[in-house]
Amino acid sequence: AVDLTLLANLRLTDPQRFFLTCVSGEAGAGRGSDAWGPPLLLEKDDRIVRTPPGPPLRLARNGSHQVTLRGFSKPSDLVGVFSCVGGAGARRTRVIYVHNSPGAHLLPDKVTHTVNKGDTAVLSARVHKEKQTDVIWKSNGSYFYTLDWHEAQDGRFLLQLPNVQPPSSGIYSATYLEASPLGSAFFRLIVRGCGAGRWGPGCTKECPGCLHGGVCHDHDGECVCPPGFTGTRCEQACREGRFGQSCQEQCPGISGCRGLTFCLPDPYGCSCGSGWRGSQCQEACAPGHFGADCRLQCQCQNGGTCDRFSGCVCPSGWHGVHCEKSDRIPQILNMASELEFNLETMPRINCAAAGNPFPVRGSIELRKPDGTVLLSTKAIVEPEKTTAEFEVPRLVLADSGFWECRVSTSGGQDSRRFKVNVKVPPVPLAAPRLLTKQSRQLVVSPLVSFSGDGPISTVRLHYRPQDSTMDWSTIVVDPSENVTLMNLRPKTGYSVRVQLSRPGEGGEGAWGPPTLMTTDCPEPLLQPWLEGWHVEGTDRLRVSWSLPLVPGPLVGDGFLLRLWDGTRGQERRENVSSPQARTALLTGLTPGTHYQLDVQLYHCTLLGPASPPAHVLLPPSGPPAPRHLHAQALSDSEIQLTWKHPEALPGPISKYVVEVQVAGGAGDPLWIDVDRPEETSTIIRGLNASTRYLFRMRASIQGLGDWSNTVEESTLGNGLQAEGPVQESRAAEEGLDQ
């Protein structure tokens, strides 16, 4: 059953202090409009019991598992039916609380009546303020029966309902004729869909034998335990002041659960908390009584004492509900009341037992719901107990239900039933949703509807390029967060699938359906700024550019340089594959050609705006070599070079370049510019004494020409070490190029 409790605070001296609280112990309850469950609803149900309109009630959510209703201004606001709805999907459950006015003419002896199909139900309305008029009984707001006021028995009006059936369930009321409906006695009748001790379709299945006032649910055979008890059969008492299916909730306030009415899912109904009774749940149990509404009697044996919250507290050497079992009788120890496994797994189940004589492996057996008996494959024997381990065959859905561990020795036998829930691993029913895309990443929402059972513990996203045979890439993500798939290829389709897992071994479900998601390739928007170009030869051009500053990362994969030769109608394209590049050397161009040059940023196959075009004229082939180069030593640090101009020049010479190198030296040669092209001689100064040098030279028009012949000459002897060669008297800073 759904773990849902509706608490009513019955301290009625001041209606403004009255509150109703709905508490859910369900995983993911009340989280709102996400994929894991609708919110808790708590409201007054005016369909049957209508009260005068008043100020609206205040609903307050305390975290995701609790909702409280306040704001009652007068006692009449309280009278009627309240309901709390919680749980998701097929487990959505309504818990109902019926409130009677303490000052009503008629009061119910017992508000909630849970009966079995075919039983006789008796509703008893006690006279609180007598009126000498007939009593009208209504069922779900419609007239049902009239009793003459003389028919009161012992100050009570009784309504007998023989052979009740599930449709008879609902809200019943007893009202004096012509009295205010608010003075009625309101009842709730719950008719189980089966006879006593039975459940399931056709009522063929046997209930587990719910203890401590627990009620067997007619649909799933589970025990709905009274507040303050837990376990598959409600066999275990919670600590005082605790409630909920796992005793996880605590009653508010210093006086624990005093003054609180607890309403649980049908077929339980409502009662006081364990250890309390009375119309306002403010009276402690009388000695010898315990449990919800103090309905249970202890009847402790063998020196056991009665605790009004938990029942018999046994002295050492005894156990059992009434301390009737000697510890010499074998006893199943610490058996979990409920176990959960995933479909098609082969779990190991342990069952521990103690007793005298000591249980051995063969004396412990495990019985499945279909009656199959499993024998243990091994046993661990310890001084105080024997633990038998059972290897369960591959689980199927039909294995869900009550299993039993049984121990038998000559000292007697004990058995413990426990519930096994076989859960179906979740399988996505839909593909994941694409939220946003970029050129190298996709943002995906993995939250999808699924078949099978939750809760979802992990979400795996599998992805790979469309039509690829490569392995799938996998990313494990938090179920509630969006996922960013990174380092993808731009403008590429990816097949993306979700795989969900629930807790436990074998909880991974099958992969969901694939969806195709394509990475983006936004068009680059930046226009490069052409800084200039440098003619490095008749067929070589170095180009420099830059970009304007933009916020955020640069959108681009590289640059495309285009050279358009209009004369020949040819385009040369140079791809620079780094978006960080700002220069490029273009080689293999046609000398003497007029080119139009521009630069564009590209991204995938998209081109951004081109820089404004520049008109570049490459020089024709360089001039011929200077003729008759001759070298003559002038001193220990100076050598004069003389030459004749080249013949058949294509244009005016802009400069000469002299190359100087020490003969046999390993170092780089030195280049010196002669900026006055009309000259036919120059003096190279700053040379080392007694050193042999090699010289050659070439002319430049717009590009450098051919080298002349190489000449050798030595400086004169015994000079000082010089700083380095210079041409004439000017250091060739600008023209010097290593």
């Epitope: 700024w529 800084e531 200039g532 075009p613 520049a614 717009q702």
Partner: antibody, heavy 116, light 107 residues
Amino acid sequence: EVQLLESGGGLVQPGGSLRLSCAASGFTFSHYGMTWVRQAPGKGLEWVSVIGPSGGNTMYADSVKGRFTISRDNSKNTLYLQMNSLRAEDTAVYYCARVWGAFDIWGQGTMVTVSS
Amino acid sequence: DIQMTQSPATLSLSPGERATLSCRASQSVSSYLAWYQQKPGQAPRLLIYDASNRATGIPARFSGSGSGTDFTLIISSLEPEDFAVYYCQQRSNWPRTFGQGTKVEIK
């Protein structure tokens, strides 16, 4: 020898105008972007404006946008900076420089003083 | 705009000592950083371009390093003529921006 030579600086009143020139020699002027950089007395360097090799595209610092205009005459190997609506904070040495990746060649600068 | 921050503002050293100047960019400028030297009354002179390349005619005692946002200029052994103000400048994007300068003075 590669050289840049600025001229046209001087004293001008706030709101007035001035035109700076920069004569280039020793390199193919029309192949390179050119820029103006200024330096207020005792302060650091501040980029002012830049123009592409063919003069078709220009950029300005926010502090001078709408008041200064950069231009060039490739036939005369000359760069210009027309400065209008001058303010006291425009007082600085103005340098022209060649743009080749970095600013690889600089002129010696010309002083502009804006004062009443 | 990309902000360039130089440190220290002033460096007091003796000739022959090693000088280490730092420059930090407010966002990555790849390796597109230049260093300039400026002596009083003179125009700036390009020393290093693209973070580590020496300009023509610059002595080997000047070296640059770094990429992204952090850059360093090292003068391995200070000569008397090296005492000046040094500026870094990013050339990754327009507008070009300079650091505020580091003054290297004689101790």
